[in-house]
Amino acid sequence: GPGPCDGNPCANGGSCSETPRSFECTCPRGFYGLRCEVSGVTCADGPCFNGGLCVGGADPDSAYICHCPPGFQGSNCEKRVDRCSLQPCRNGGLCLDLGHALRCRCRAGFAGPRCEHDLDDCAGRACANGGTCVEGGGAHRCSCALGFGGRDCRERADPCAARPCAHGGRCYAHFSGLVCACAPGYMGARCEFPVHPDGASALPAAPPGLRPGDPQR
């Protein structure tokens, strides 16, 4: 059958030894009683760690209580509480326990005390000169109106800078976009289609309302 010391009936770190009738606890300094359950430690002994406040225990017969500061627990405030286990940081932020305070270390693209502000969304994001904000892939960008460029569409862009006219066509900037003046033998908005010798072309059917060679809006 189970021995009298099974499960260690001695509290507060006491060691148990079997006796002919039952068991006996050898108590560590500062404790006594059948099961070492009575504390002989008083507040005068300074039993509270980590800045804990000791209350009571003025005489050996009355127990003391440690009131622990934030971040600590245990009868003597000896255990550090993992306050970060509450996961206070949003959007994948890392929790940092300074000791006196918790702080959130935010991933790129997020900010705020709890990393609650998404810097990559279009909310409150202004794209200048008629540009529109486009979200995607955890980032945002401005899709700029023709003639503008840059991160916020604040820079004037030359629509002809990218040489959009194929096959030697000449590009002209126009208030509504750009116009390609095609070299002989080519046609289309970007001079992309060769004109066949018989007068036909490899041009696909034009969308309604747009003649081949018209500027694209």
Epitope: G93, L98, H100, A101, R103, R105
Partner: antibody
Framework: QSVEESGGRLVTPGTPLTLTCTVS????????MSWVRQAPGKGLEWIGI?????DPYYASWAKGRFTISKTSTTMDLKITSPTTEDTATYFC????????????????????WGPGTLVTVSS | ALVMTQTPSSVSAAVGGTVTINCQAS??????LAWYQQKPGQRPKLLIY???NLESGVPSRFKGSGSGTEYTLTISDLECDDAAIYYC??????????????FGGGTEVVVK
């Protein structure tokens, strides 16, 4: 509650030097502590902190040049290989701040500060 | 990384006057800003935390304000004892650059 630095002296370049910050009136396990330095006639420059749990963090320029550690009552700053540019007064300070990072109450600050200890690096 | 830019580097005013010191953060710091006063040969002294909270024992002549990236320290009814260098400081917590507590470059206040 107070903090005080010690260990500052004249050293030759390359000779490691350890500064000590001794605290009284509060527990180092409860507070983060910081080192800040000030070169003669210059502004304040943050070096690094050590959290209540003992984790150090450094300014990018200070990584590898300094090591912060602590015991139950003192915090140390080791200048691993001092150069003349490390000549400065070194301050230690306790970090205070709102307990949790919430939008309504969110601040960090250094208080109290020690009087500083002067390190002179010269050949 | 977070950069704190303080202006002006020096300001002069007469006793009884008012001075304004500006601190600009390179990004939103959500009012997590402290102001310190340092006199020659002395340790820095905390004046204001959380952008606008006056530290205990600091005269109400010192006023902190601002939000987002722009912050101001205003000293009114200037006294000779206010002659010092003033520093702003914030905190920066990211996963990429660990943590930072950068100071502004400082502003010298001269009282005439």
């Amino acid at each position: 509650q107070s903090v005080e630095e010690s260990g500052g002296r004249l050293v030759t370049p390359g000779t490691p030097l350890t500064l000590t910050c001794t605290v009284s009136g509060f527990s180092l396990s409860r507070y983060a502590m910081s080192w800040v330095r000030q070169a003669p006639g210059k502004g304040l420059e943050w070096i690094g902190i050590i959290t209540g749990g003992g984790d150090p963090y450094y300014a990018s320029w200070a990584k590898g040049r300094f090591t912060i550690s602590k015991t139950s009552t003192t915090m140390d700053l080791k200048i691993t290989s001092p150069t003349t540019e490390d000549t400065a007064t070194y301050f230690c300070a306790r970090m205070i701040g709102s307990e949790y990072a919430s939008s309504s109450e969110y601040y960090d600050a250094f208080d109290p500060w020690g009087p500083g200890t002067l390190v002179t690096v010269s050949s | 990384a977070l950069v704190m830019t303080q202006t002006p580097s020096s300001v002069s005013a007469a006793v009884g006057g008012t001075v304004t010191i500006n601190c600009q953060a390179s990004q939103n710091i959500y009012s997590n800003l402290a102001w310190y006063q340092q006199k020659p040969g002395q340790r820095p002294k905390l004046l204001i935390y959380g952008a606008s909270n006056l530290e205990s024992g600091v005269p109400s002549r010192f006023k902190g304000s601002g939000s987002g990236t722009e912050y101001t320290l205003t000293i009114s009814d200037l006294e000779c004892d206010d002659a010092a260098i003033y520093y702003c400081q914030s905190a920066y917590y990211t996963t990429s650059v660990d943590v930072l507590y950068p100071f502004g470059g400082g502003t010298e206040v001269v009282v005439k």
